[in-house]
């Protein structure tokens, strides 16, 4: 089997001119392509992978909402040579361009990483944005997290920062098959420089600390922080909006995926995608746009522009 192969990390890694082909190893019987688009109120970007996969042919579209951060995930697997170029990995350009100045800032201020590399999204390096309320939702919290896409034996991960509705969420996440958007929320100006080590304790409630008795040399007792995980089964339709139901992590159980899609844990992906040659050093993130007048889930469905006669 021969498949198209590329990796896109908010750059042009899967753009038309960068397309590669790869011969799959023995026992690999599907080509796969997966794309995850993340939209904040200040823009959007996408990560994508094409390559040799495993499992069964099929499609899965899923919409995800994490405290006002929107994500759209698409997975397509097929069993013919070079069949994995059906998803549109190009985010739609705004026409006319979004005009952020039309929105009234609500006072919150956050670091924003939309399609920035991990190097450019460190600490206080990324740009600072003014939050505003959009679509009847109040965006007064700041978010620091990651989007991760795993397909074709490749994992692509990018940082995500921006304005969200929640001000206290901790290690919260939403998932699709091979796709995760997760992170933590905070309150206060530019508070989202680094929330990787945020604990579940609310800033308003002092943590309970157990001190050892002062005299006896008894073994020290460690405060254990256990958190429950709400498991949400994916609905039977292939397109759905999933929202976290609690302040803790809300995950789609890997064993309750839509049946037409590979069981991410049950069958490891093999074959792999050849890396894309170089990253977009002269431009920004492909399709980096403002949300103000955007289609709800741009890029959903649709095919890339075919060459004359198609493929």
């Amino acid at each position: 089997l021969e498949c198209y192969s590329c990796v896109q990390k908010a750059d042009d890694g899967c753009s038309p001119h960068r397309m590669k082909t790869v011969k799959c190893g023995p026992g690999v019987d599907v080509c796969t392509e997966a794309v995850g688009a993340v939209e904040t109120i200040h823009g959007q970007f996408s990560v994508a992978v094409r390559g040799c996969g495993s499992g069964i042919p099929g499609k899965n579209d899923r919409g995800l909402d994490l405290h006002g951060l929107l994500a759209f995930f698409q997975l397509q697997q097929c069993s013919e040579d070079r069949c994995n170029a059906k998803l549109n990995l190009t985010l739609r350009g705004l026409n006319p361009a979004g005009n952020e100045s039309a929105y009234e800032p609500n006072g919150a201020e956050c670091y924003s990483c939309v399609g920035l590399s991990r190097e450019k999204c460190q600490g206080s390096m990324p740009p600072v944005v003014n939050c505003y309320n959009a679509s009847g939702r109040v965006y007064k919290g700041c978010f620091d997290g990651n989007v991760t896409l795993t397909a074709a034996n490749v994992t692509v991960s990018l940082p995500v920062r921006g304005c969200v509705q929640d001000e206290t969420c901790t290690r919260d996440g939403v998932t699709g098959p091979g796709f995760t958007l997760s992170g933590s929320c905070c309150q206060g100006p530019r508070c989202n420089a680094d929330l990787r080590n945020k604990t579940y304790f609310s800033p308003r409630i002092p943590p309970l600390v157990l001190l050892p008795p002062p005299t006896t040399a008894a073994p020290s007792t460690r405060a254990q922080n256990s958190s429950s995980t709400t498991s949400t089964a994916a609905p039977t339709t292939t397109t759905s909006i999933i929202k976290p139901t609690t302040a803790q992590a809300s995950h789609t159980s890997p064993h309750e995926m839509d049946l037409e899609v590979i069981q991410e844990e049950g069958a490891s992906l093999s074959g792999g995608a050849a890396g894309h040659g170089g990253t977009a050093g002269h431009g920004g993130a492909a399709g980096h746009q403002d949300r103000s007048n955007m289609e709800k889930y741009p890029g959903k469905g649709g095919a890339q522009i075919p060459a004359k006669g198609g493929s």
Epitope: S15, P16, T90, L91, G93, I305, G310
Partner: antibody, heavy 117, light 112 residues
Framework: EVQLLESGGGLVQPGGSLRLSCAAS????????MSWVRQAPGKGLEWVSY????????YYADSVKGRFTISRDNSKNTLYLQMNSLRAEDTAVYYC??????????WGQGTLVTVTS | QSVLTQPPSASGTPGQRVTISCTGS?????????VHWYQQLPGTAPKLLIY???KRPSGVPDRFSGSKSGTSASLAISGLRSEDEADYYC???????????FGGGTKLTVLG
């Protein structure tokens, strides 16, 4: 029917500037990656620059980097190439081309740029 | 000096089969990037002839075929006709140059 129509070429002195335009029709311009490719008289094809559908990702050939600027106006279905500090070796027919499925699937008829003193 | 190497000229008589080669390196064709072929008739703009190694756009006769192996590719024209007389260019993406690259072009002459 897909059509690409270049304009703006002409005679210019070394060090001068020109702005080329490419008017597109017959397809959804805002979804297409676009490129400029040039061909010096009697020579082969040379890729100059490309721009993503939204205009956010841009690349240039080393030979024009820092002198040429590619841009697009999706509301006008038009691609541009601003050429500054022109040199004699920039003399060529400049084509705008649409990037289809991995290839330049449609080309304009070209516009001639002549740089001479 | 072009990044992709093509013979400067090729020729054949009507009805013959002609092959044009295109040799690249590990940063372009050898890296797995797909190869395209363009035909440029005298005084006209280039036209896409073969894309994605071996696919033909609609309207291109099946006399034209492409193939790719390792760091090289080739274009074959069978049943040669006088209207095939043109310049032929191969192209692929190049990692090092971060952009599409072309071969130097092959001038095909149909004899007789």
């Amino acid at each position: 029917e897909v059509q690409l129509l270049e304009s703006g070429g002409g005679l210019v002195q070394p060090g001068g500037s020109l702005r080329l335009s490419c008017a597109a029709s017959g397809f959804t311009f805002s979804n297409a990656w676009m490129s400029w490719v040039r061909q010096a008289p009697g020579k082969g094809l040379e890729w100059v620059s490309y721009i993503s559908s939204s205009g956010s990702t841009i690349y240039y050939a080393d030979s024009v980097k820092g002198r040429f600027t590619i841009s697009r106006d999706n509301s006008k279905n038009t691609l541009y190439l601003q050429m500054n500090s022109l040199r004699a070796e920039d003399t060529a027919v400049y084509y705008c081309a649409r990037e289809g499925l991995w290839a330049f699937d449609y080309w304009g008829q070209g516009t001639l740029v002549t740089v001479t003193s | 000096q072009s990044v992709l190497t093509q013979p400067p000229s090729a020729s054949g008589t009507p009805g013959q089969r002609v092959t044009i080669s295109c040799t690249g390196s590990s940063s372009n064709i050898g890296a797995g990037y797909v190869v395209h072929w363009y035909q440029q008739l005298p005084g006209t703009a280039p036209k896409l002839l073969i894309y994605d190694n071996n696919k033909r756009p609609s309207g291109v006769p099946d006399r034209f075929s492409g193939s790719k192996s390792g760091t090289s590719a080739s274009l074959a024209i069978s049943g040669l006709r006088s209207e095939d007389e043109a310049d032929y260019y191969c192209a692929a993406f190049d990692d090092r140059l971060n952009g599409p690259v072309f071969g130097g072009g092959t001038k095909l002459t149909v004899l007789g």
